[in-house]
Every structure is written in C-alpha cells, then in structure tokens.
Amino acid sequence: EAIQVTQPSVVLASSHGVASFPCEYSPSHNTDEVRVTVLRQTNDQMTEVCATTFTEKNTVGFLDYPFCSGTFNESRVNLTIQGLRAVDTGLYLCKVELMYPPPYFVGMGNGTQIYVIDPEPCPDSD
Amino acid sequence: EAIQVTQPSVVLASSHGVASFPCEYSPSHNTDEVRVTVLRQTNDQMTEVCATTFTEKNTVGFLDYPFCSGTFNESRVNLTIQGLRAVDTGLYLCKVELMYPPPYFVGMGNGTQIYVIDPEPCPDSD
C-alpha cells in the first residue's frame, strides 16, 4: 500500500558540503518501525546513499553511515548529508517504508535537488 | 512583435559569488541594436538588475554596471553577474529587445534560478 512522501524540491549544501532537508509522510500511522532510504538518481539509475530503520526506541538513525544522519519524530525525518562536493550535485529521493506493524506501506518522494559548490581553498598562511 | 528567449533554468554561483549564463533569442535577425535587460523577480515584483545595448561595434556590454558584464555574438548573450551573496539567490530573467532596424521585437526568458551560498570566512593567518 502507498503513502505520500514529501520533501523540498531544492536544497543548497552549505560551503562545508552539508545539506539538510525534511522528509515527511502521510497519512501518519502509529508505527513501531519506519525504514528510511536516501537514493540518488542519476539518469535512469538509482543508487542507495544510506538507509536506516527508526524504531520506538531508536529515533536517531544512520549510525552505520558516516555521511548521513537523521532524526525521527512522528511522521517527519530530518535528514542531513555531509561530505558533499560539487560532483555530488543531483537529485536525492527519500523512500519511506512502514515496516511494523503490518500492513506494509511504502512511498517515495519526488526528490530534492541538492546543489553543491566547492569552496575556494583559503590562501596559505605565511 | 515577439521573439523567443531561452536561458537555463538553474545556475549555481561560484564560491566567489559569480554566476554566468547564456541568454539566446530566436528567430535570429540581422540586427544593428539589441538591448538586453536582466531583471530579478521577487514575489510578483520585477526589479532591474542591469541593462545594456549591444551594437555591431559594441559587443561588450554593461560597462556602467559594476556587477554585470556580458558579451554578444549573433543571437546569444553571455551574461555574468558578480558580487552575489546568499541573499541574492532568486530568479533572474533575461529580456531581449531588437531595437533597430524596425520592426521592434521583444521577448522575455522564463528566468534562471541563481543559487548563491556564502563562503565560510578563512581563518585569520597569524
């Protein structure tokens, strides 16, 4: 069954290469386990960037991924991707799966275009 | 009479606050004078950023505007806006007017969304 997932259409990474954006789903269900996957779309190909399962006890996710972090609250996940460079500019999709209790629900956002600009190196200090 | 003006939908300013993009029009006319105006749209309001008239002798424009520069070649103008900061992020429209010889033609592009990220200041050198 499907749920609706919303995410911002555009986000600018900071000059440190950090991009943060919310991923929300509706209708909101009383859910024990919510799996969130961030995918990057390049051409017709989707590659997984990071994924985590939020549970009633574990509301901080992506502990296995150095470049992703996220917090979960009700039906909203605040995602942060760091270590971004200009070559990482692209469309990042948020996929949400309600894993427990059944029934299984899944939804995919339309994607957030993340723009990344590489900073100029600072001049060497003499 | 109307001409079609095309410009890219999105451009990222460099970390130095410089954004460059082309503005092209068609059909191409053999024209002595082409006036190009860059406008910024905020909400429902348009404000002029800079304007110049290119002639057969004068293919470098915006000499009166410190933040704009541009070169003209046939039916294409290469625009550069500098000194941009994050607050300048927005939609920039290119307006083209074929001034001479008559008939008068005018066209407006759909706008280029320029994204600007302020760089982090470099640490003070001791």
Epitope: N30, D32, E33, R35, A51, T53, T55, E56, K57, N58, E97, M99, Y100, P101, P102, P103, Y104 | -
Partner: antibody, heavy 124, light 107 residues
Framework: EVQLVESGGGLVQPGGSLRLSCVAS????????MHWVRQAPGKGLEWVSA????????YYADSVKGRFTISRDNSKNTLYLQMNSLRAEDTAVYYC?????????????????WGQGTLVTVSS | DIQMTQSPSSLSASVGDRVTITCQAS??????LNWYQQKPGKAPKLLIY???NLETGVPSRFSGSGSGTDFTFTISSLQPEDIATYYC?????????FGQGTKVEIK
Amino acid sequence: EVQLVESGGGLVQPGGSLRLSCVASGFTFSSYYMHWVRQAPGKGLEWVSAISGSGGSTYYADSVKGRFTISRDNSKNTLYLQMNSLRAEDTAVYYCARGRQVGKSSFGEAFDVWGQGTLVTVSS
Amino acid sequence: DIQMTQSPSSLSASVGDRVTITCQASQDISNYLNWYQQKPGKAPKLLIYDASNLETGVPSRFSGSGSGTDFTFTISSLQPEDIATYYCQQFTSFPYTFGQGTKVEIK
C-alpha cells in the same frame, strides 16, 4: 541453543484468571517481537497477541481484546500473557513464538522459534 | 480479517510421491505467506517464509511458490518423517491468520 519455555497453564473456572510465562534463552530477547499463538484441542492454529521489542506496542486478536494482556520483562528475558475473564473457548495449548527482529531491513515476519506449549483448560 | 483456505484438508500418499498443498487467501497478500509443519504433540516448525524461501536447516524437498492470492506448498519426494499437519499463514496484516491445516499421511 535458542529456546522458549512456557509455563503457567492449568485448569481454571470460567471467569477466572491465569498468567502464562515464556522464558527465552540463546538470543537477544529485546531485539525481537514476541507472539502468543494458541491451538484448541484437535483444531488449527490461532494467533492471539504480539508485543514489540521494548514492550511499548501491543497487538491483540479481537477474540481476546480487553481480556488478555501481553507484556514482557526484558531484564528477565520473559514474555507474559495475563488472561482474565476466561471462557470455555479459550481452552487451548498456548505457544509463545519469536517473531520479527527489530530493525530488520525488509518487511515480513515468521515464527521461527516456538516454545513447547502450555495447556490452559477452562472448565467448571 | 483475511481468510486462508487450505486444500485438501487431508491426503494420503506413498513414500517418494510428490505432494502438493494449496492455500488461497481471501485477498491479495503479495508474497507475505509462511508455511509450517506440526507433528502430533509438538510445536509448529517454520519451513518456508515469504512464500518461497526455505528456512535454514529445512530439507530441500520442501518448496513453496505463489503470489497474490494463490500459493502452493510441495514435498517433492515424501518421506516417512514428513507425516504431519501443514499450515499456511499470512502476515500481511493483523490479525495473522492460518489455514485450517492439511494432514499428510502415508499410504
């Protein structure tokens, strides 16, 4: 060895109460959803109740809702089923079963470990 | 609730025979179906999960297939130790429901 051992069954009069226990060993108890499934004599299997790994969420079949309470004590690796207002139709062998691992990356649940069962007889 | 209908309710076959049991769901359950074996006086044992995946340690003569509403459980070559009752179970939604069981006997 992964094991579940139930206890607490017995003969009880209609309207009475009973508490079943299920002690788990050989796995991280708090990392699994746990279930109770029953089987009336000579009949098929009927799912009764489920509880999340932390005990924060509970689920019941309509036939027992409001009468039975599932709970767990993760410090004791023990699952419970408190049965009140018992009826003759609650007579069955009650099994505890291990369900889904919390945080599993795919949807789905199967009862891969079962206890030996404990018989509850409701009769006057 | 989702109804699970198994057929036949019982069957008798010879050692070495191919045995097939079907399970029909009252609505689409995708591949969210498990199969269990229960021997007399014992607890059920998981054989197949997610309609077609063999549980670790279960002999390869057991298999499952199907999706949607129609599912099949097969024993490719019946062995004496396979005498038991077999149940299908859906996990699409609570309450989880089981088929009424199929009793397999040796001729």
